[in-house]
Amino acid sequence: LQDLCSNCPAGTFCDNNRSQICSPCPPNSFSSAGGQRTCDICRQCKGVFKTRKECSSTSNAECDCISGYHCLGAECSMCEQDCKQGQELTKKGCKDCCFGTFNDQKRGICRPWTNCSLDGKSVLVNGTKERDVVCGPSPADLSPGASSATPPAPAREPGHSPQ
């Protein structure tokens, strides 16, 4: 006896109660591949989740996180809270960056300020909880009598602040 179920396309299921007729998936369900004997229940994006893509008869809904949260896990299975700039997310919630560290993102951890003196430079702009320090010319360049024709030292490459 030929299995007629293999002929059932995505968006349908093989209804054994009706002589293996291909029946459309009921509302709020889907089948993403052919030959399915059941349709899967659509994911519901509610609460802290919001719908990024509606469920169709052939594909599941896709969720995102509402404002103030970001996705974690496969297919945004979890929502983790954002913190403010100048904070980091710990196991016990958002905590301010300690002195000498900063975070300019809504997620991630606080990182140490750049140590300008390692590059032979001085601090031009002090760091804050939200911003790294800005390094300026070396102290020698700022001393009286220093040649103003000395070109400034090359800037740090972006993304190379110490971790």
Epitope: L89, T90, K91, K92, I109
Partner: nanobody
């Protein structure tokens, strides 16, 4: 491939108990700290408890301290969460997670792999 598979969730009455398990594979289980987190309906992720790779250090969120116990059996590559005196506010999807090192604390998240979750419903 690193995999974490939770089980043991279900419906329980307030005051009741449940024991969640998390079967780990694809990595040297005893070398890594493990963590339980949960997500209640309509809320964000909440840290529950963490345990070091050797099992000698454990940490708990204030909301579960004295009611939940985290443990591990490194010979079986399994993490556990014994939940007693359950309350309605413990209703959530519980996820087991692998941390990036063998040590842990109640401060930094250091999670690099998540399980799929198991649902715990506390209701009369």
């Amino acid at each position: 491939e690193v995999q974490l598979l939770e089980s043991g969730g279900g419906l329980v009455q307030p005051g009741g108990s449940l024991r969640l398990s998390c079967a780990a594979s694809g990595f040297t289980f005893s070398n890594y700290a493990m963590t339980w987190v949960r997500q209640a309906p309509g809320k964000g992720l909440e840290w529950v408890s963490s345990i070091s790779g050797s099992g000698d250090s454990t940490y708990y969120a204030d909301s579960v301290k004295g009611r939940f116990t985290i443990s591990r059996d490194n010979s079986k590559n399994t993490l556990y969460l014994q939940m007693n005196s359950l309350r309605a506010e413990d209703t959530a999807v519980y996820y087991c997670a692998k941390e990036g090192t063998g040590t842990t604390s109640d401060y930094y998240y250091n999670v690099d792999v998540w399980g799929q979750g198991t649902t715990v419903t506390v209701s009369s």
